[in-house]
């Protein structure tokens, strides 16, 4: 009886793993083996595919074959017993085009209210992605184990930190890789779970802001407790994209090591032009906080994005605020050559209840005020460009009293 050729051959490539699967065309015939040949583009001869000769099952692995992954190849298969079937030719394919990105390797670290995720490609020194290793980005899905409500985070790099979590809570997540340059989306990693720690005695510093004063940067932050010492560290932001060895060499800012106030001042020339990450940690001598959230600090923008200067004209039920260009040292106005929006915060002097107005215009009305009442106003500028997404620090608060009734005209 003539043997039939195997049918429905599927080629699965995940990272550097090349797997072939096929269907037996005749289940009734026992002790059949299968063999593959391959042919490279531009070649006439067929070569035996090592790892896929005389196979008794309907699956084989030809990962050991050192192929040029960008070169088209053709495969053929036949069945063998005493005689052989005719060859069945598989459509030619380019391994790189066909390849899927495998699940990445994931390691987790826990803090009390944060999780650090370290991600690396599932196949070390992959041949398939050798030219693209630096281009991987990742996305993840995270959920509280108890609730299952998922949150997606896109476009992250090989180390990512998720903040604002709850202490002593188990979070689960899965991660997949993408090569946006090749329109490839990978498969998810297995689910990894980790429990955040008990709440730390010392919270991390919050609300870190950088401003420019004369030739110095002024770094300010908020802290819950008094009598603390703080240290500030910096890192080149581009290193976060580097899938290298997961060791980020954060550096001390010398003037911000063991400072006893919630601010520190250091010369602008500490940083060359570039984008940096900054973080702050608190210590009381016995205990140390976890690091604050990292803030992005762009020397180019920071140097120019100063808090706005404004004048207030007081009426009985409103303030008219006129925003002008900020002044540098020497009282010269700064030319801001990119569009800004202004955030104006005002409050009654005797109250903590703040109200906020966001405006693109440089003349702003603050309505619904009470007559003969002292209100305080502060403002800051934001860049409108999403990529830059920078904010100045708030200006100093200016307090004014509204006029007596009926002066709104």
């Amino acid at each position: 009886k003539n043997l039939k050729s195997p049918q429905k051959v599927e080629v699965d490539i995940i990272d550097d793993n090349f797997i072939l699967r096929w269907n037996r065309s005749d289940e009734s015939v026992g002790n059949v083996t299968f063999s593959f040949d391959y042919q490279k583009t531009g070649m006439d001869n067929w070569i035996k595919l090592s790892g896929c000769q005389n196979i008794t099952s309907t699956k084989c692995n030809f990962s050991s074959l050192k192929l040029n992954v960008y070169e088209e190849i053709k495969l053929r298969i036949r069945a063998e017993k005493e005689n052989t079937s005719s060859w069945y030719e598989v459509d030619s394919f380019t391994p790189f085009r066909k390849a899927q990105i495998g699940p990445p390797e994931v390691h987790l670290e826990a803090e009390d209210k944060a999780i650090v995720i370290h991600i690396s490609p599932g196949t070390k020194d992959s041949v398939m992605w050798a030219l693209d290793g630096l281009s991987f980005t990742y996305s993840l899905v995270i959920w509280k184990n108890s609730s299952g409500v998922e949150e997606r985070i896109e476009n992250i790099y090989s180390r990512h930190k998720i903040y604002k979590l709850s202490p002593e809570t188990t979070y689960c997540l899965k991660v997949k890789a993408a090569l946006l340059t090749s329109w490839k989306i990978g498969v998810y990693s297995p689910v990894h779970c980790i429990k955040t720690t008990v709440e730390n005695e010392l919270p991390p510093p919050e609300n870190i802001e950088v401003s420019v004063q004369n030739q110095n940067y002024v770094l300010k932050w908020d802290y819950t407790y008094a009598n603390m010492t703080f240290q500030v560290q910096w890192l080149h932001a581009f290193l976060k994209r580097n899938p290298g060895n997961h060791l980020y060499k954060w550096k001390q800012i010398p003037d911000c090591e063991n400072v006893k106030t919630t601010q520190c001042v250091f010369p602008q020339n500490v940083f060359q032009k570039g984008i940096y990450l900054l973080r702050v940690q608190a210590s009381d001598g016995n205990n140390t906080s976890f690091w604050s959230e990292e803030i992005k600090f762009d020397t180019e923008i920071q140097a120019f994005l100063l808090p706005p200067v404004f004048n207030i004209r007081s009426l009985s039920d409103s303030f008219h605020i006129y925003i002008g260009a900020p002044k540098q040292s020497g009282n010269t106005p700064v030319i801001q050559d990119y569009p800004l929006i202004y955030e104006i915060i005002f409050w009654e002097n005797t109250s903590n209840a703040e109200r906020k107005i966001i405006e693109k215009k440089t003349d702003v009305t603050v309505p619904n005020l009470k007559p003969l009442t002292v209100y305080c106003v502060k403002a800051r500028a934001h860049t409108m460009d999403e990529k830059l997404n920078k904010s100045s620090v708030f200006s100093d608060a200016v307090c004014e009293k509204t006029k007596p009734g009926n002066t709104s005209k």
Epitope: A110, E111, I194, N245, H246, Y248, K249
Partner: antibody, heavy 118, light 107 residues
Framework: QVQLVQSGAEVKKPGASVKVSCKAS????????IHWVRQAPGQGLEWMGR????????KYAPKFQGRVTMTADTSISTAYMELSRLRSDDTVVYYC???????????WGQGTLVTVSS | DIQMTQSPSSLSTSVGDRVTVTCKTS??????VAWYQQKPGKAPKPLIY???YRYSGVPSRFSGSGSGTDFTLTISSVQPEDFATYYC?????????FGPGTKLDIK
């Protein structure tokens, strides 16, 4: 493969200095920190400090501050630990180790015994 | 400085037994704890990093758990080559510190 090979045993007099070397191979020393840990006979491990070979930034344990100097020569992939004003209780084994972020101290040298004796 | 205590300080056990060593830190160190095994005259051998991850080549009978201030090293079935001293190590903040060690010997 990754290796840290330390210099040989030394005998020193009290008050003298000793300089122990740690030669790295199988990785770029600039990409990691090199830590130094010591161990007295029959005792536990004691962290002395670390150096970033890329820019020579150091952190020392307060106990050794002022007496220890860590340096590195990246051209020959070697880190050094010098301890001055030696006392008899500095008779210990000194280890160098590679620090790899959350992987901690993932490779160690074989250790160097320094004996301080008059 | 972050203090580290380990218990027990020594432990006599038999091949095949399950052994647990605990380590306490004087403050929350997240999951920045590693474990090392040391045999006489040898350098420490890394076993566990980041609380629960085994280094490559470390047998699966070794496992780590915990977070915050309480950490555990477990050997599920002690083998003859496991008789050694075990150290925990915090690398959360400088100066880094080690536990005093737990000596595992044959009963």
């Amino acid at each position: 493969q990754v290796q840290l090979v330390q210099s040989g045993a030394e005998v020193k007099k009290p008050g003298a200095s000793v300089k122990v070397s740690c030669k790295a191979s199988g990785f770029n020393i600039k990409d990691y920190y090199i830590h130094w840990v010591r161990q007295a006979p029959g005792q536990g491990l004691e962290w002395m400090g670390r150096i970033d070979p890329e820019d020579a930034e150091t952190k020392y344990a307060p106990k050794f501050q002022g007496r220890v100097t860590m340096t590195a020569d990246t051209s020959i992939s070697t880190a050094y630990m010098e301890l001055s004003r030696l006392r008899s209780d500095d008779t210990v084994v000194y280890y160098c180790a590679r620090y790899h972020g959350y992987w901690a101290l993932d490779y160690w040298g074989q250790g160097t015994l320094v004996t301080v004796s008059s | 400085d972050i203090q580290m205590t380990q218990s027990p300080s020594s432990l006599s056990t038999s091949v095949g037994d399950r052994v647990t060593v605990t380590c306490k830190t004087s403050q929350n160190v997240g999951t920045n704890v590693a474990w090392y095994q040391q045999k006489p005259g040898k350098a420490p051998k890394p076993l566990i990093y980041s609380t629960s991850y085994r280094y490559s080549g470390v047998p699966s009978r070794f496992s780590g758990s915990g977070s915050g201030t309480d950490f555990t090293l477990t050997i599920s079935s002690v083998q003859p080559e496991d008789f050694a001293t075990y150290y925990c190590h915090q690398y959360f903040s400088y100066p880094y510190t080690f536990g005093p060690g737990t000596k595992l010997d044959i009963k």
